[in-house]
């Protein structure tokens, strides 16, 4: 399978497990979490950076806390620096992480899928029309 | 091939100790997480341990947590598994299994166990 | 925690049926946290779907996953004499089982 077959299953992934995580918000710390929304074009992987960065935990309530420390382990699992540096040229100007608007855990994730799935179309996207700027 | 073995299995009385080793090859072993799962006699599947690819960290099933403790080697592809403590109720067959999916970007990504061992017997009694 | 159920705890076909088998648990689950695994006597597990739907390496599309939330199904489209075994369902992350659903020949 081509690597950027790989790349696009891992994505995809990154969704079921917010989606996982979305089951148990009630067991998340009710933490607000700067959690980038309308990302401007070229600084997706810096917004997805600030995701990974943010301090999702689990309230330590007993139940499923097993499945959401996997969970949360997994969603912040790093790309290879190909990925996340294409936009390297872009980042300086790319907003930093303190600087997006705090959001509770239930709403934290929403964003995270929406710039999941925005970074999903954007590779498809790029690969139909043949660019190799994904 | 890739491969699991495991080791250290036997008959060991109420309140001792043992300790499982599960040889692996064939693969990066590094790069995966690890699992004990455990069947006793005539019953079901039963997840026993967990421990991240690096080591970084581990989940136990409630009916071990205190008693048993998962390891691994890196360096010698080895995995562990010393259990303390030991119960009449511990009695069963212990398989190591590999995590389905890699630490690696590109490498596999199967939310499940794909790779499992033969088996080791432990038999708890007086 | 979560708790699968399987049913039926038995199921006796005959080669060249179809098997539906039953896994439905207490609790959503996203797809990708869906396992199904093959047990014959004697010998370990081996993986035959992942991600509630993906067959893992080298298993026959006789097996095929299906399913969402809480209920999930793995169906063998044509017995056949290698099939009969027991089959458990499993939750990724918390790694809970199923109790198992034994297919037997009839």
């Known amino acids: 399978m081509q690597g950027q077959d790989r790349h696009m299953i891992r994505m995809r992934q990154l969704i079921d497990i917010v989606d996982q995580l979305k089951n148990y918000v009630n067991d998340l710390v009710p933490e607000f979490l700067p959690a980038p929304e309308d990302v401007e074009t070229n600084c997706e992987w810096s917004a997805f950076s600030c995701f990974q960065k943010a301090q999702l935990k689990s309230a330590n309530t007993g139940n499923n806390e097993r499945i959401i420390n996997v969970s949360i382990k997994k969603l912040k699992r790093k790309p290879p620096s190909t990925n996340a540096g294409r936009r390297q040229k872009h980042r300086l100007t790319c907003p930093s992480c303190d600087s997006y608007e705090k959001k509770p855990p239930k709403e934290f994730l929403e964003r995270f899928k929406s710039l999941l799935q925005k970074m999903i179309h954007q590779h498809l996207s790029s690969r139909t029309h043949g660019s190799e700027d994904s | 091939q890739v491969q699991l073995v495991e080791s250290g299995g036997g008959v060991v009385q109420p309140g001792r100790s043992l300790r499982l080793s599960c040889a692996a090859s064939g693969f990066t072993f590094s790069s995966y997480g690890m699992h004990w799962v455990r069947q006793a006699p005539g019953k079901g599947l039963e997840w026993v341990a967990f421990i991240w690819y690096d080591g970084s960290d581990k989940y136990y099933a409630d009916s071990v947590k205190g008693r048993f403790t998962i390891s691994r080697d890196n360096s010698k592809n080895t995995l562990y598994l010393q259990m303390n403590s030991l119960r009449a109720e511990d009695t069963a067959v212990y398989y190591c299994?590999?995590?389905?999916?890699?630490?690696?970007?590109?490498?596999?990504?199967?939310?499940?166990?794909?790779?499992w061992g033969q088996g080791t017997t432990v038999t708890v009694s007086s | 925690e979560i708790v699968l159920t399987q049913s039926p705890g038995t199921l006796s076909l005959s080669p060249g049926e179809r098997a539906t088998l039953s896994c439905r648990a207490s609790?959503?689950?996203?797809?990708?946290?869906l396992a199904w695994y093959q047990q014959k006597p004697g010998q370990a597990p081996r993986l035959l779907i992942y991600g509630a739907t993906s067959r893992a390496t080298g298993i026959p599309d006789r097996f095929s996953g299906s399913g969402s939330g809480t209920d999930f199904t793995l169906t063998i489209s044509r017995l056949e004499p290698e099939d009969f075994a027991v089959y458990y369902c499993?939750?990724?992350?918390?790694?809970?089982f199923g109790q198992g659903t034994k297919v037997e020949i009839k």
């Open positions: 609790q959503s689950v996203s797809s990708s946290y």
């Open positions: 299994a590999r995590d389905g999916d890699s630490s690696d970007w590109y490498g596999d990504y199967y939310f499940g166990m794909d790779v």
């Open positions: 499993q939750q990724y992350g918390s790694w809970t």
